[in-house]
Interface confidence: low
């Protein structure tokens, strides 16, 4: 798709000028290259009328000019003395007139209304509200008032007093007579159609001594506003209705082919299946004001976006409407990472968030997608020391490697993980990523016991086995709280038993407590990394009691509780529960999680561009 | 009647610093895009920075970018240009503009002048 882009319909009348501005995306290249106004003919071909070089046709000597706003990637046509010769289908464009950079323009120059003499002129915009007031004489008080419209030489009744209403008005319409003292009747017509434009003629009584008034009515459809956002970010659509709205239900709907536009997200619960899991609508103002969030923006996001309200939840004529054109840039700066994380029950998954590394002092946040109430992103752990209660223990969020990307680390995996989540900070919305986590079959790589239980005064080694793929990378053992995870000394222990075949590259490094206190009991996890990038990570949880027999604990796989697998997670008090509280913090500004905070892209291996961007959470 | 007014010019010292407000009425504010630009002496009125309508976004020109920043308070329908570390060159009128990039309302402009 031309990346150029202006508007679609220019209607004006005879003697009248226009002004059309194209939009293109600024880049240095296309700042300095040829603009263009060009008159499309019957076989095709377009016919320069002017352009930025300096050229123009003597059609158009005297009466037009186009001027470039490099700047801000914009470029201006004025065309006056218009006549209905000038109506036709144009292109604005760059470069070359058949290299195809360019946007189709039809103009439509129609002959003068000829408005009569003392006629209001009504200019609304597109679904709202207008008010006709009709003022009358007191010797037609009592007679019969009426509205018509002037189609082609007849006026067409559309409402009057005695009670009739035209069928294109139904349930739109109506018409108020003030008191007496007033002497003014008025029709108020809602959920103003493209086709309600026109002249009207009201009338009060029916006979040569009747008060007329004329009234021309202009309805205007939303320009849309351009939007221009990197691939793999995030947009922010800011729909303000009005509050005579704001109880009607809310749309965000994407333009297809001719006039249909096919619903993204309403608050009645609809969703496209293509933006599960990086889409919010956030809580409506009172005044009825609403925004939508779409993270995680791909090539085929670009396009024709509507906001509207209405009871059906889409687009139905009438509706009150905001526009915006999506443009998506594919020479992005946020990096490209995966958008599927795999991981095995029992097993773990490290996500690599990328954020805008001028903001490395932001807060980092990680929060779960949830579809219900048009979707939602509880806070699951931030960078400031919180973690959502439920997660305690295997989750964290870890400011390495840093320089643009943050990781969060999530072990103990049961099937209630899988799902879409999102990394955030409270810094550059448009860095908001997303990450689908995958719960696959398999066993995890790392093996630890299952529960541990240390003795007070006594000495605690607590074993860990490490698979020879893992024989490149650093080891480690860290005790887990709400900040991260302190690294502690382990110690290599030799070639593990714990694995057929495989040779004597498989390790177990054993952490070892030394005079237990209270203070060690927690969450243990150990883990692999290379440098500052984290691979899979084991927990393990160690109580602490009272001495009941001399001696130091050697705790083996075998003498403990087996692996973690699903069934030990879902007993017992490592049992997870994923319901996530709503949190206030996510409401903050712009009402939203994603209008504040950035989003996740992914864990931490690299990605074939050819590939479908997934990432396995269990081998690196 | 739609009125568009700027105000906060005046005389500055390089290096200093100003902060312009465009009161706009007569129109619904929060359906434009907003824009300021300036005109210096014997040249052709050029952008300086323009905020969406809801003011989720903002451009700004070459000369201007991390110097000038543009806001607006929609509920107060004002726009504003926060212009600090000024430069000679930076002398112009400045105008505010409502829909700019469409030829919308524009006002009459406030003389910027910064001595050296």
């Known amino acids: 798709k031309s990346p150029i882009f202006g508007p679609e319909e220019v209607n004006s009348v005879e003697g009248n000028s226009v002004s059309i501005t194209c939009y293109y995306p600024p880049t240095s290249v296309n700042r300095h290259t040829r603009k263009y106004w060009c008159r499309q003919g019957a076989r095709g071909g377009c016919i320069t009328l002017i352009s930025s070089e300096g050229y123009v046709s003597s059609k158009y000597a005297g009466r037009a000019n186009l001027t470039n706003f490099p700047e801000n990637g914009t470029f201006v046509v004025n065309i006056a003395q218009l006549s209905q010769d000038d109506s036709g289908r144009y292109k604005c464009g760059l470069g070359i007139n058949s290299r195809g950079l360019s946007f189709d323009v039809s103009l439509e120059v129609s002959q003068g209304p000829g408005l009569l003499n003392d006629t209001k002129v009504y200019t609304v915009d597109l679904g709202r509200t207008v008010t006709i007031n009709c003022p009358f004489k007191t010797e037609n008080a009592q007679k019969r008032k009426s509205l018509y419209k002037q189609i082609g030489l007849y006026p067409v009744l559309v409402i009057d007093s005695s009670g009739y209403v035209n069928p294109n008005y139904t349930g739109r319409i109506r018409l108020d007579i003030q008191g007496t003292g007033q002497l003014l009747f008025s029709v108020v017509i809602n959920q103003l159609r493209l086709s309600d434009a026109g002249q009207y003629l009201c009338q009060a009584g029916d006979d040569s001594n009747s008060n007329k008034k004329n009234a021309d009515l202009q309805v205007l459809k939303p320009e849309p506003e351009l939007v221009y956002e990197d691939l793999r970010g995030s947009v922010t659509f800011h729909c303000a209705l009005g509050p005579e709205v704001a109880n009607v239900a809310k749309f965000l709907c994407r333009q297809s082919s001719g006039e249909n536009c096919d619903v993204v997200v309403n608050t009645l619960g609809k969703r496209a299946p293509a933006f599960e899991g990086r889409i919010l609508l956030n809580p409506q103002d009172k005044d009825g004001s609403f925004s939508v969030v779409i993270t995680g923006l791909r090539k085929e996001d670009a396009g024709r976006y509507l906001c509207g309200a209405h009871s059906d939840g889409q687009l139905q004529e009438g509706s009150p409407i905001q526009a915006w054109q999506l443009f998506v840039n594919e020479e992005s700066t946020i990096p490209r990472s995966p958008t599927v994380v795999k991981g095995v029950a029992g097993g773990s998954v490290a996500v690599l968030c990328p954020y805008n590394r001028k903001e490395s002092k932001s807060i980092k946040y990680w929060c779960l997608w949830e579809g219900a109430q048009n979707g939602r992103c509880p806070l699951l752990v931030d960078s400031e020391g919180w973690v959502k209660a439920q997660y305690e223990g295997r989750l964290s969020l870890l400011e390495e490697p840093g320089n643009g990307t943050f990781t969060v680390i999530l072990n103990q995996l049961t099937s209630r993980d899988a799902g879409f989540y999102w990394c955030l900070t409270n810094g550059d919305t448009l860095w908001r990523t997303t990450v689908e986590i995958k719960i696959i079959e398999g066993e995890p790589n790392l093996k630890v016991p299952g529960n541990v239980t240390a003795v007070l005064g006594e000495t605690l080694k607590v074993p860990c086995h490490f698979p020879c793929k893992f024989s490149s990378y650093e080891k480690y053992w860290c005790k887990w709280n709400n900040t991260g995870c302190q690294a502690l000394p382990s110690q290599d222990e030799g070639p593990s038993k714990a694995f057929v075949n495989c040779d004597e590259n498989s390790r177990l490094v054993s952490l070892t407590l030394n005079l237990v206190t209270r203070a060690d009991e927690g969450w243990y996890w150990c883990g692999v990394k290379q440098g500052h990038f984290y691979g899979e990570t084991a927990a393990v949880y160690v109580a602490v009691e009272e001495r009941k027999a001399a001696g130091s604990r050697d705790v083996s796989l075998a003498k403990a509780d087996a692996a973690p697998d699903e069934k030990v997670l879902d007993s017992g008090f490592r049992e997870i529960e994923n319901k996530a509280i709503q949190d206030p913090r996510l409401f903050a500004e712009e009402k939203a999680v994603a209008d504040t905070r950035d989003q996740a892209d992914g864990s931490r291996a690299s990605v074939d561009s050819g590939s479908s961007e997934e990432q396995g959470g269990s081998s690196r | 009647e739609v009125q568009v007014v700027e105000s906060g010019g005046g005389l500055v010292q390089a290096g200093g610093s100003l902060r312009l407000s465009c009161a706009a009425s007569g129109f619904t504010f929060t359906r434009y895009a907003m824009g300021w630009f300036r005109q210096a002496p014997g040249k052709e009125r050029s952008f300086v920075a323009a905020i969406s309508w809801s003011g989720s976004s903002a451009g700004y020109g070459d000369s201007v970018k991390g110097r000038f920043t543009i806001s607006r308070d929609n509920a107060k329908n004002t726009l504003y240009l926060q212009m600090n570390s000024l430069k000679p060159e930076d002398t112009a009128v400045y105008y505010c503009?409502?829909?700019?990039?469409?030829?919308?309302?524009w006002g009459q402009g406030t003389q910027v002048t910064v001595s050296s």
């Open positions: 503009a409502a829909d700019p990039f469409n030829q919308g309302y």
